[in-house]
Interface confidence: low
């Protein structure tokens, strides 16, 4: 069998969106089956065409329609004859357009008046490519042969560019990049005490707007008064935004603020925040516990305990917990130095212990106070060896 | 003044072909993309679609490739929206725009400042 | 295909503060837009570039972006300002444009 590439060229060059129709004329065989191949892939065409010539003389077609450039490359058909592959001469297929870009401006954040660089490429066929770059609708600067570097002194306001290309065949045009302004950030807002104790308390907040720029750090900074003395300030990295303050005293009114800095500097602080640190669990356990036997039960006295510092505020009410060792338990919550035991089994040892309780919890618990199943009244001290505590 | 003109509402059966236009005026045609927004009854708005008249480059929003062209004719400073078989889905309201900045190099204008007062395209049986 | 996403409806009383939000993946690095449309007309531009109020804008209307939420805050509100609320960007490699779905805001 004879192949042949008919009415073409080694090399055929063609505008993008033309169409192309290779011809395979193939003589020596009756209905070939000819395959067009390209780059080594055979080609899956629809539109391939055979029309018979004589009864051993066929054509082939392969009809693109619109050629784009992903069609260029190197052609050839084939046919199967005896077990073997023929193949013909190739073509080199070559689609022609307006640029395409391989590189187009990206959008940007600098700070003003800072120097920067956008690039833009483009590439044939046909060759060779040249870029006119815009600043918004103003042409900036003669053609310059692809790949083009613009170099900008700088901005003062967000500024729009583009790049143009041009070859034999057009124009094509770039995205627009769009070259942000940083900008100091805006204020933090949200922000909240979030866990508090007696000398920590743990702050999150929301950054506001970076100004287009990586925020860096904030700064927390706590007085005991709004606008008073700096008690502390808390340079923090971030993310995440929080903070934890330490070594707070208790019982005590601050107010703190939150600024987040970027490259450019520190954002307006945010409104000031007030908080209150917890005061301090009593210090003293209540003495002096003793029970005293009735008809109607059990009476138990204590003294009452004295606030030993301010920062433990008011103290009361008294928690009074008691156990027996056939395991019946119970705590009550009392708002005097006396309490009236009810629901107790005579019978079995009985162990009392009490403490005082502020806002923020209670205190120590006192020696326990043991009354035994035969005593008429208990007696502070040790617990009886059979009772576990 | 800035003016975008566009055609006048239309009824049409389902596979019927359609093209509408916007003309321009009281700026430089070739300097502006011009974009076509959908608005079906009821609905919200869709971006369809823009080109720049200069260079006759086209977007197209994903859900519009293929089903609609968008085009202009630069001696006559119009854009045409156009469809080859239009569906009852079609139904809407069309928007020509012209975006507030001079993008004339970009791809996608910035926003949009200038609206024509739509132009009503029903699709029906 | 890029989506942004907003409510389908606020409600606020005659001076409250109203919040329109409007979320995408490609909002920290493109800017959001909000359009105001009435019914029957064609919409109108209410805030560019994340913040900045469009001419003839009343100052109640302000806008403001972080992270991937864009917002539209109008202080204030009142019955002229009920209509619906779009809100406009890019996706991210700026091929094409998105109106989100819309907002419609009633002023009670």
């Known amino acids: 069998a004879g192949l042949k590439l008919m009415g073409a060229p080694v090399k055929l060059t063609v505008s993008q969106g033309q169409p192309v129709k290779l011809n395979c004329s193939v003589e020596g065989m009756e209905e070939p089956d000819i395959q067009w191949v390209k780059d080594g892939a055979v080609v899956q065409n629809l539109d391939q065409l055979y029309i018979p010539v004589s009864e051993q003389h066929w054509i082939g077609f392969l009809s693109l329609k619109s050629v784009e450039r992903s069609d260029a490359g190197r052609y050839w058909c084939q046919v199967e004859d005896g077990g073997e592959t023929e193949i013909s001469q190739p073509v080199w297929l070559t689609v022609e357009g307006v640029p395409f870009f391989t590189v187009e401006p990206k959008d940007l954040a600098v700070p003003p008046n800072a120097p920067f660089q956008l690039s833009c490429e483009a590439v044939g066929p046909p060759e060779p490519v040249t870029i006119v770059w815009w600043r918004g609708t103003t042409k900036i600067g003669g053609p310059a042969p692809s790949p083009s570097v613009l170099n900008v002194t700088g901005v003062t306001q967000s500024t729009m560019f583009s790049c143009e290309a041009h070859n034999l065949k057009g124009l094509a045009s770039s995205r627009t990049a769009t070259v942000h302004l940083q900008a100091l950030p805006a204020a933090p807002f949200n922000i909240t005490v979030t866990k508090l104790s007696s000398s920590n308390a743990s702050v999150a907040w929301m950054p506001g707007a970076d100004g287009r720029a990586l925020l860096q750090s904030c700064t927390v900074q706590v007085t005991q008064a709004p606008g008073g003395w700096e008690v502390l300030a808390v340079v923090v990295p971030v993310p995440p935004f929080t903070c934890l303050l330490r070594d707070l005293v208790p019982a005590t009114n601050y107010s703190l603020r939150v600024r987040c800095a970027n490259a450019l500097g520190p954002s307006p602080y945010a409104d000031w925040v007030p908080f209150q640190t917890k005061g301090l669990a009593p210090a003293s356990a209540p003495q002096n516990l003793h029970a005293i036997r009735t008809d109607s039960g059990l009476i138990l006295e204590w003294e009452e305990v004295i606030p030993e510092a301010p920062l433990e505020g008011p103290l009361g009410p008294y928690k009074l917990s008691w156990v027996q060792d056939n395991g019946t338990q119970d705590e009550l919550t009392v708002e005097g130095t006396r309490a009236n035991l009810t629901g107790w089994d005579p019978q079995k040892d009985l162990i009392v212990r009490v403490c005082v309780s502020n806002a923020v919890g209670c205190g120590p618990w006192s020696q326990p106070l043991v009354v035994s199943s035969h005593d008429r009244a208990g007696q502070q001290g040790p617990p009886h060896s059979r009772t576990s505590w | 003044e800035v003016q975008l003109v566009q055609s006048g509402a239309d009824v049409k059966k389902p596979g019927a072909s359609l093209t509408i236009s916007c003309q321009a005026s009281?700026?430089?045609?070739?300097?502006?993309?011009i974009s076509w927004v959908r608005q079906k009854p009821g609905k919200g708005l869709e971006w369809m679609g823009q080109?720049?008249?200069?260079?006759?480059?086209?977007n197209y929003g994903p859900s519009f490739q293929g089903h609609v062209t968008i085009s202009a004719d630069r001696s006559t400073a119009t854009a045409y929206l156009q469809w080859r078989s239009l569906e009852a889905s079609d139904t809407a309201m069309y928007y020509c725009?012209?975006?507030?900045?001079?993008?004339?190099?970009?791809?996608?204008?910035?926003?949009?400042?200038?609206w024509g007062p739509g132009t009503l395209v029903t699709v029906s049986s | 295909s890029y989506e942004l996403t907003q409510p389908p409806s606020v409600s606020v009383s005659p001076g409250q503060t109203a919040r329109i939000t409007c979320s995408g993946d490609?909002?920290?690095?493109?800017?959001a837009y909000w359009y105001q449309q009435k019914s029957g007309q064609a919409p109108v531009l209410v805030i560019y570039e994340d913040e900045k109020r469009a001419s003839g804008i009343p100052e109640r209307f302000s806008g403001s972006s972080s992270g991937t939420m864009a917002t539209l805050t109008i202080s204030g509100a009142q019955v002229e300002d009920e209509a619906d609320y779009y809100c406009y960007s890019q996706e991210r490699n700026g091929n094409y444009a998105v109106f989100g779905g819309g907002t419609k805001l009633t002023v009670l």
């Open positions: 009281g700026y430089t045609f070739t300097d502006y993309w």
């Open positions: 490609a909002l920290p690095k493109k800017y």
């Open positions: 725009v012209r975006p507030y900045f001079q993008t004339s190099g970009g791809t996608i204008p910035e926003y949009y400042q200038h």
């Open positions: 080109i720049v008249p200069r260079a006759s480059r086209t």
